[in-house]
């Protein structure tokens, strides 16, 4: 087995990221073949972590193509019958070592997932999986622990009747001590350790054992079948077994002799010289979550899964939290409904991603009668007299800028300000000088003119104030009515949208 950069992926990169020595571990996880989200469900069939891991230290310019890997086997014990079809998850983990790494640090380098078919008792099946820039070569097989036997590791054990001990002549099952060995159905004397049977009165040998009762290791076997006894020192003359002796075809393949050699006819889902390789095709449905399987028409060609929205991974086994990408703009609320993404928009925004700014001024942006002015993709408030700030929420002193001309006195008022003009001047800001003898007012002239009739002046001021107040009230009324209409329109739309969302969530 090997783990490293895939072919044609540029300079092989180190798994240690130039941060000192590291070690690689493998976590193997087995799940039932129907598991729909392979990385999210439990490892129901079993899980194991590799041991005896050599330390890898990166040297400048050194190729990472051949990394020292955990030696020996990763054994995943499974308690129940072997299902034949299963999901295999292999995770490659890096443990960063050394002080400058800040103590041991674990990182998941790669995860491969795939549905597999494998009968127990067969030879090693080889596989190659790519994920990102990494490539993992590995072999796997399933073996039954006695007394379980056959392609499905069926138990030839039954539940014990008495809690304390097994019946006469029967012993506890291993590895199932809570059960007792079943009454013998195999050929009497058939080795319980190295032989098994699927039919009564037969004795089939596990790998490495032979003889009528499976008691003879293959290496020291006495001369069997057509093998001719030889001199005592040599034990046997071995002209070679018949090509189909012992059935070299694994996984239920049938052997036929062809010109001194053999040929295996493999059952569906297996291929290779001895039917030892488990091939998954698109017809096996290897892609989870409705993913589209492309390629893989035959077991020799690799398949690729094209995932539905919201899923990723080599077999579409991982759910993506699409809301983490913050797809809803302008403060919209994101709801991932599985195969649909919904954004609930704030007032004033619409569209699948809340990208449409319906009306910058929709959300009562300007307070205290201020008017919202759009422009250049942004909004600003033109505030009513007496108010200021971004949203017109701050009280302003209207007299601070000394708005009354010609010595007029400024008084702050609920609608803004009022100027009490000095003798000889009139107007909202005391900008007009008053002509003698009731002539029309003119813009301010040099001083020395006669003072106007105070009563007429006061009437002018009141008239101006009334006009201003009426204008402001009318403006507010128009603004409130138009806003109410707009809000009613979007409340309807939002109620409809929430109804749709509720339906989808219920679905």
């Amino acid at each position: 087995h090997s783990f490293g950069p895939g072919p044609g992926l540029g300079t092989p990169r180190s798994p240690c990221n130039a941060r000192g020595p590291c070690r690689l571990f493998f976590r193997v996880c087995l799940k039932p073949g129907v598991s729909q989200e392979a990385t999210e469900s439990l490892c129901a069939l079993g899980a194991a972590l590799s041991t005896s891991v050599p330390v890898y230290t990166e040297h400048p310019g050194e190729s990472a193509a051949a990394l020292p890997l955990p030696d020996g086997l990763v054994r995943v014990p499974f308690r129940d019958a072997w299902p034949g079809t299963f999901s295999l998850v292999i995770e490659t983990w890096r443990e960063q070592l050394g002080e400058h790494a800040g103590g041991p640090a674990w990182n998941l380098l790669a995860r491969v997932v795939g549905r597999r078919r494998l009968a127990a008792g067969g030879p090693w099946a080889r596989d190659v999986q790519r994920t990102g820039t990494w490539e993992l070569h590995f072999s796997y097989r399933a073996r039954c622990e006695p007394p379980a036997v056959g392609a499905a590791c069926a138990r030839l054990c039954r539940s014990r009747s008495a809690p304390s001990r097994c019946g006469p002549g029967l012993r506890p099952c291993t590895p199932f001590p809570d059960e007792c060995e079943a009454p013998s159905v195999c050929r009497p004397g058939c080795s319980p350790e190295h032989g098994y049977c699927e039919e009564p009165d037969e004795c089939r040998c596990l790998e490495g054992w032979t003889g009528p009762l499976c008691t003879v290791p293959v290496s020291t076997s006495s001369c069997l079948n057509s093998r001719v006894p030889g001199p005592a020192s040599t034990g046997c003359l071995l002209p070679g077994p018949g090509p189909c002796d012992g059935n070299p075809c694994a996984n239920g393949g049938s052997c036929s002799e062809t010109s001194g050699s053999f040929e295996c006819a493999c059952p569906r889902g297996f291929y290779g010289l001895r039917c030892e390789v488990s091939g998954v095709t698109c017809a096996d449905g290897p892609c989870f979550n409705g993913g589209l399987c492309v390629g893989g028409e035959d077991p020799d060609s690799a398949y690729v899964c094209h995932c539905p929205p919201g899923f990723q991974g080599s077999n579409c086994e991982k759910r993506v939290d699409r809301c983490s990408l913050q797809p809803c703009q302008n403060g919209g609320l994101c709801l991932d409904l599985g195969h649909a993404l919904r954004c609930r928009c704030r007032a004033g925004f619409a569209g699948p991603r809340c990208e449409h700014d319906l009306d910058d001024c929709a959300g009562r942006a300007c307070a205290n009668g201020g008017t919202c002015v759009e422009g250049g993709g942004s909004r600003r408030c033109s505030c009513a007299l007496g108010f200021g700030g971004r949203d017109c929420r701050e009280r302003a002193d209207p007299c601070a800028s000394r708005p009354c001309a010609h010595g007029g006195r400024c008084y702050a008022h609920f609608s803004g300000l009022v100027c009490a003009c000095a003798p000889g001047y009139m107007g909202v800001r005391c900008e007009f000088a008053v002509r003698p003898d009731g002539a029309d007012a003119v813009p301010a002239a040099p001083r020395g003119l006669r003072q106007a009739d105070p009563q007429r002046f006061l009437a002018g001021v009141i008239a101006v104030i009334v006009v201003v107040v009426i204008a402001i009230v009318a403006g507010i009324v128009v603004l409130v009515i138009s806003r109410k209409k707009r809000m009613a329109k979007y409340e309807k739309a939002e109620i409809k949208e929430m109804g749709e969302m509720h339906r989808e969530l219920n679905a």
Epitope: L292, P308, P352, R353
Partner: antibody, heavy 117, light 107 residues
Framework: EVQLVESGGGLVKPGGSLRLSCAAS????????MNWVRQAPGKGLEWVGQ??????????HYAESVKGRFTISREDSKNTVYLQMNSLKTEDTAVYYC????????WGQGTTVTVSS | NIQMTQSPSSLSASVGDRVTITCKAS??????VSWYQQKPGKSPKLLIY???NRYTGVPSRFSGSGSGTDFTLTISSLQPEDFATYYC?????????FGGGTKVEIK
């Protein structure tokens, strides 16, 4: 070779019922989402509904136009998916196809349903 | 539901012609668009998935392009067996929806 074969179509009166079947071969049926898609005469394609896997509790989804009237079920042991159609309307007249997956990769040959008085 | 608008609804072309069919989505569907071919009396067949990827066994004269809301199916050199109706479908948002179809006829 992958094959999906629909059956059960025919002529039915408005308000009547019909049960369509789709038998699959050449695929590991239990690993596939199954859909029904229909096509009214001279019209385009319309997705009708979907059933997912045993591990997903055989979850079903339906188009708004058939919700409450149509029911999809499956029998993995028989490699078959069903479409039970109740309260049929004239607008349900169409050729009904069964398809696999999310992207409708494999299709059956279709079965014709005619709703007419 | 997302609407898919296909154009033209029909077109006449000769063998060897370059044919382009367009499909417009009512909202952004990324690249989750597939194209299907349907011959009279037959079931649809998947041609293109993911907007631009040819499905297994589909000839190289078929190509797809586009993303977001505008998509195109192109047949670089029309062959006699290509006369059929073509449908686009979006798979971005559930439920999947299809365009009205484009019938490619012999001129």
């Amino acid at each position: 070779e992958v094959q999906l074969v629909e059956s059960g179509g025919g002529l039915v009166k408005p308000g009547g019922s019909l049960r369509l079947s789709c038998a699959a071969s050449g695929i590991t049926f239990s690993n596939f989402w199954m859909n029904w898609v229909r096509q009214a005469p001279g019209k385009g394609l319309e997705w009708v509904g979907q059933i997912r896997l045993k591990s997903e509790d055989y979850a079903t989804h339906y188009a708004e136009s058939v919700k409450g009237r149509f029911t999809i079920s499956r029998e993995d042991s028989k490699n078959t998916v069903y479409l039970q159609m109740n309260s049929l309307k004239t607008e349900d007249t169409a050729v009904y196809y069964c398809t696999t997956g999310y992207y409708f990769d494999y299709w059956g040959q279709g079965t014709t349903v005619t709703v007419s008085s | 539901n997302i609407q898919m608008t296909q154009s033209p609804s029909s077109l006449s072309a000769s063998v060897g012609d370059r044919v382009t069919i367009t499909c417009k989505a009512s909202e952004n569907v990324g690249t989750y668009v597939s194209w299907y071919q349907q011959k009279p009396g037959k079931s649809p067949k998947l041609l293109i998935y993911g907007a631009s990827n040819r499905y297994t066994g589909v000839p190289s004269r078929f190509s797809g392009s586009g993303s977001g809301t505008d998509f195109t199916l192109t047949i670089s050199s029309l062959q006699p067996e290509d006369f059929a109706t073509y449908y686009c479908g979006q798979f971005y948002s559930f439920p999947s929806t299809f365009g009205g179809g484009t019938k490619v006829e012999i001129k």
